[in-house]
C-alpha cells in the first residue's frame, strides 16, 4: 500500500511541478526594472523569455516579442533550451508514469514492467526538474552579472552618447515559480524512483511453503531447497531447480502482495 501511495504522490507532485515549469516558461515576469531617471512617467519594465513589456503609471502597457534570435544573448537562448527540454522530458515522464501507476491496469502488464516504467519516469522527472532549476538559476545569474556591471558610458561619438540607465531591478515572479516547480518535479522524480524499488518483484531465495490439511494425509513441500546438513552437495544453500516438479504456488496462482488495485 505504501508503494502505491508513494508512486501516486510522486506522480501528483511531478504533475504540479511540470505545470509550474510550463507556467514559468510562458510568464513575462522573469526580470523587472523600474526606470528611475524618467522625467515623464513612472515606467515599469518586465521581461520574459519570449517578450518584453512596458507598463506606465498612466496605465499604458505594451509587449513586444523577440522576433530575432540574433540580437539576443546566448545565455537567454540557453535558458529557453533548458526550460523546453525540461518541459518535454517532464511531459514524456508524465505519459510513461500514467501507464506505470499501480492503480491502473493495462492488459497483463507485469510488476517488473511497471517498475521499469516507474524508474524511467522518475529519472525523467529528476532531469526535468534539474533542467528547470538550472535554467532559472542561469537567468538569475545573468541578471545579477549584468546589473553589477559598470554603468559607465558605453560609447560616445558624433557628439552623441549612449550610457546605461540606473534602474532598480528585481527577480521576477517567474524565477520563483520556476525554482519551486523545478524542486517539486525533482522531489516527485525521487519519489517515483523510491516507489520503483517497492514495485520490483523481489527475487526470493525460497519458494513458499504450502501446508495442506486434507483428511489424514498432510503434505509438506519445502520447495526448491534441500535441507542442508553440511554433508550433501548443496552445502552453500544454492537453489536447486527441480526439473518438472512444481510447488503448490506454481500450480495455482494466488494473488500476490503486489496485485491489489
Amino acid at each position: 500500500m505504501a508503494v502505491t501511495a508513494c508512486q501516486g504522490l510522486g506522480f501528483v507532485v511531478s504533475l504540479i511541478g511540470i505545470a509550474g515549469i510550463i507556467a514559468a516558461t510562458c510568464m513575462d515576469q522573469w526580470s523587472t526594472q523600474d526606470l528611475y531617471n524618467n522625467p515623464v512617467t513612472a515606467v515599469f519594465n518586465y521581461q520574459g523569455l519570449w517578450r518584453s513589456c512596458v507598463r506606465e503609471s498612466s496605465g499604458f502597457t505594451e509587449c513586444r516579442g523577440y522576433f530575432t534570435l540574433l540580437g539576443l544573448p546566448a545565455m537567454l537562448q540557453a535558458v529557453r533550451a533548458l526550460m523546453i527540454v525540461g518541459i518535454v522530458l517532464g511531459a514524456i515522464g508524465l505519459l510513461v508514469s500514467i501507464f506505470a501507476l499501480k492503480c491502473i491496469r493495462i492488459g497483463s502488464m507485469e510488476d517488473s514492467a511497471k517498475a521499469n516504467m516507474t524508474l524511467t519516469s522518475g529519472i525523467m522527472f529528476i532531469v526535468s526538474g534539474l533542467c528547470a532549476i538550472a535554467g532559472v538559476s542561469v537567468f538569475a545569474n545573468m541578471l545579477v552579472t549584468n546589473f553589477w556591471m559598470s554603468t559607465a558610458n558605453m560609447y560616445t561619438g558624433m557628439g552623441g552618447m549612449v550610457q546605461t540607465v540606473q534602474t532598480r531591478y528585481t527577480f521576477g515572479a517567474a524565477l520563483f515559480v520556476g525554482w519551486v516547480a523545478g524542486g517539486l518535479t525533482l522531489i516527485g522524480g525521487v519519489m517515483m524512483c523510491i516507489a520503483c524499488r517497492g514495485l520490483a518483484p523481489e527475487e526470493t531465495n525460497y519458494k513458499a511453503v504450502s501446508y495442506h490439511a486434507s483428511g489424514h494425509s498432510v503434505a509438506y513441500k519445502p520447495g526448491g531447497f534441500k535441507a542442508s546438513t553440511g554433508f550433501g552437495s548443496n552445502t552453500k544453500n544454492k537453489k536447486i531447480y527441480d526439473g518438472g516438479a512444481r510447488t503448490e504456488d506454481e500450480v495455482q496462482s494466488y494473488p500476490s502482495k503486489h496485485d491489489y488495485v
Epitope: L35, V40, V43, S52, S57, E62, Y66
Partner: nanobody, 121 residues
Framework: EVQLQESGGGLVQPGGSLRLSCAAS????????MGWYRQAPGKQREFVAG???????NYAHSVKERFTISRDNAKNTMYLQMNSLKSEDTAGYYC???????????????WGQGTLVTVSA
C-alpha cells in the same frame, strides 16, 4: 547600436516658430521614453519636454504653454513644436531616448549630437 539624429534647428525671429525632429536608428528593440533637453552657452543642460511610449507628456514650466511634444512610435521619431519663441530659448537642443535592450537586460540612455536654435531679431 542606437543613434539619435536631430534636425529642424536654425535661426528664427522672436515670436516665431520652429519644429524639431529626432529620429532614432540602429538596432532598436523598444524606446520607452523620449525627451528634449537644451543647453545654453555657459549653462547647465536642462529638461525641456518629454513623452512616454504611451503618450504621457511632461514640460518644463518655462515652455509649458508654448511648446508641444509628440512622437510616432512606429517610426521611432519625436517632434517638438516650438511656438512664441523668445531670445532665452536660444540653445543647443538635444534629443534623449531611453531604450530597452533585451540583449543586455538593461536600459540604455541615448543622446543625440544636438541641433542649434537661435532666436534673434
Amino acid at each position: 547600436e542606437v543613434q539619435l539624429q536631430e534636425s529642424g534647428g536654425g535661426l528664427v525671429q522672436p515670436g516665431g516658430s520652429l519644429r524639431l525632429s529626432c529620429a532614432a536608428s540602429g538596432n532598436i528593440f523598444r524606446i520607452d521614453t523620449m525627451g528634449w533637453y537644451r543647453q545654453a552657452p555657459g549653462k547647465q543642460r536642462e529638461f525641456v519636454a518629454g513623452i512616454s511610449r504611451g503618450g504621457s507628456t511632461n514640460y518644463a514650466h518655462s515652455v509649458k504653454e508654448r511648446f508641444t511634444i509628440s512622437r510616432d512610435n512606429a517610426k521611432n521619431t519625436m517632434y517638438l513644436q516650438m511656438n512664441s519663441l523668445k531670445s532665452e530659448d536660444t540653445a543647443g537642443y538635444y534629443c534623449n531616448a531611453q531604450a530597452w535592450d533585451p540583449g543586455t537586460i538593461r536600459y540604455l540612455e541615448v543622446w543625440g549630437q544636438g541641433t542649434l536654435v537661435t532666436v534673434s531679431a
